[in-house]
């Protein structure tokens, strides 16, 4: 038989951040290889990662075609050295993945504070708009382009001299906050999709950025500081 001693894949798991989407599975192959297929609920199966000895397959190119669709993948197991045979009618063992809807399930990547600028007692904080691999009319879209108003940012800010944090929220990538004159502040932002009710509702916090430091002055803290 063409599938002798092959083991079906298991623990199929979607790993997705900002729409970069990889399907992972087990086991590490011994004398076998894998091929992955992906489809939408109503579409045809498309094969990817042909006869690979890896236990992961990058499916980003497929899911970015429509991030609001629901996708299903399956992983076929073949004997090592397998060559596609036109005469073979026996279906190799395979396992289905959980369903995956990128728009609802991709994790939000760690955001970055692009800049901050103080004018009097106001500070304008700008969050970098991350690019995704989602396209429209041959143009790559940013995270904001894809999620629109479904995506908000939360800003955490505090005086360098104290630990009491304040928060602000925005439907754009900009904040304009009131600060005390002569005080230095630190900032961190978090991306949030409020309409989600699952663990992937929030990103991790951005690296902290602080006012009043020359670039590189606080290298030992692991933080990169903007100077304005």
């Amino acid at each position: 038989s063409g599938t002798t001693n092959t083991v079906a894949a298991y623990n199929l798991t979607w790993k997705s951040t900002n729409f970069k989407t990889i399907l992972e599975w087990e086991p590490k192959p011994i004398n076998q290889v894998y091929t992955v297929q992906i489809s939408t609920k109503s579409g045809d199966w498309k094969s990817k990662c042909f006869y690979t000895a890896d236990t992961e397959c990058d499916l980003t190119d497929e899911i970015v075609k429509d991030v609001k669709q629901t996708y299903l993948a399956r992983v076929f197991s073949y004997p090592a050295g397998h060559v596609e045979s036109t005469g073979s009618t026996e279906e190799p063992p395979y396992e289905n993945s959980p369903e995956f809807t990128p728009y609802l399930e991709t994790n939000l990547g760690q955001p970055t504070i692009q800049s901050f600028e103080q004018v009097g007692t106001k500070v304008n904080v700008t969050v970098q708009d991350e690019w995704t691999l989602v396209r429209r009319n041959d143009t790559f879209l940013s995270l904001r382009d894809v999620f629109g108003k479904d995506l908000i940012y939360t800003l955490y800010y505090w005086k360098s001299s104290s630990s009491g944090k304040k928060t602000a929220k925005t439907n754009t990538n900009e904040f304009l906050i009131d600060v005390d004159k002569g005080e230095n502040y630190c900032f961190s932002v978090q991306a949030v999709i409020p309409s989600r009710r699952t663990a992937n509702r929030k990103s991790t916090d951005s690296p902290v950025e602080c006012m009043g430091h020359e670039k590189g002055e606080s290298r030992e803290t692991g933080h990169h500081h903007h100077h304005h």
């Epitope: 429209r136 879209l141 940013s142 382009d145 894809v146 999620f147 629109g148 108003k149 479904d150 940012y153 800003l155 602000a168 929220k169 925005t170 439907n171 754009t172 900009e174 904040f175 304009l176 906050i177 009131d178 309409s195």
Partner: antibody
Framework: QVQLQESGPGLVKPSQTLSLTCTVS?????????WSWIRQHPGKGLEWIGE???????RYNPSLKSRVTISVDTSKNQFSLKLSSVTAADTAVYYC??????????????????WGKGTTVTVSS | EIVLTQSPGTLSLSPGERATLSCRAS???????LAWYQQKPGQAPRLLIY???TRQTGIPDRFSGSGSGTDFTLTISRLEPEDFAVYYC?????????FGGGTKVEIK
């Protein structure tokens, strides 16, 4: 000064598709605002239909979602509404509006600050 | 969906009087997303107040908004003849965005 103008047929037959276009003048449709459709049934209140960003990102009213498509044409500075399988209950004045960011409480939030004059659509055979 | 209930349905007042319009939400609304609009017959709505209490540019200071959570109020301190119209509250924080049923302020 941004201005919006709705256009499209004033009479649509039942079961057909209602198609309206909103032309944006005095500003770019790609300038960081959202673009909305709202309707008002005769003598009644306002109902939000949906919105679109220049990138094509949309949000729809769930009660209409299965019948609604909003699209954007950045080259023409226009956005459009299609409402399929219409009935007499879809007879209304249809407005397009700009959803622009305003500063509030440390951040920016979107409000419908510029509206078209509205166009009356009657569904009747 | 969040249901916004406005009261009273109609308010009959004379020019110079104070108008107090109420908007009650079926669940808590973030003030950042609460707006008030004015609509006159045959015209499109006009944004008056956003963020529950901030006047839109060009709106006279006789208009003021207040409230939080589920209870919001629009106050017109001294009614001018051009203020007689229908007023709508709206929430734009949760899809579907919803409007209240409106309060008609008419001349007594």
């Amino acid at each position: 000064q941004v201005q919006l103008q709705e256009s499209g047929p004033g009479l649509v037959k039942p079961s057909q598709t209602l198609s309206l276009t909103c032309t944006v003048s005095g500003g770019s449709i790609s300038s960081g605002q959202y673009w909305s459709w709202i309707r008002q049934h005769p003598g009644k209140g306002l109902e939000w239909i949906g919105e679109i960003y220049y990138s094509g990102s949309t949000r729809y009213n769930p009660s209409l979602k299965s019948r609604v498509t909003i699209s954007v044409d950045t080259s023409k500075n226009q956005f459009s509404l299609k409402l399929s399988s219409v009935t007499a209950a879809d007879t209304a004045v249809y407005y397009c509006a700009r959803d622009a960011p305003y500063y509030y409480g440390g951040g920016y939030y979107y409000y419908m600050d510029v509206w078209g004059k509205g166009t009356t659509v009657t569904v009747s055979s | 969906e969040i249901v916004l209930t406005q009261s009273p349905g109609t308010l009959s007042l004379s020019p110079g009087e104070r108008a107090t319009l109420s908007c009650r939400a079926s669940e808590s609304v973030d003030s950042s997303y609460l707006a008030w609009y004015q609509q006159k017959p045959g015209q499109a709505p006009r944004l008056l107040i956003y963020g529950a209490s901030t006047r839109q540019t060009g709106i006279p200071d006789r208009f003021s908004g207040s409230g939080s959570g589920t209870d919001f109020t629009l106050t017109i301190s001294r009614l001018e003849p051009e203020d007689f119209a229908v007023y709508y509250c709206q929430q734009a924080g949760v899809v579907p965005y919803t409007f209240g049923g409106g309060t008609k302020v008419e001349i007594k």
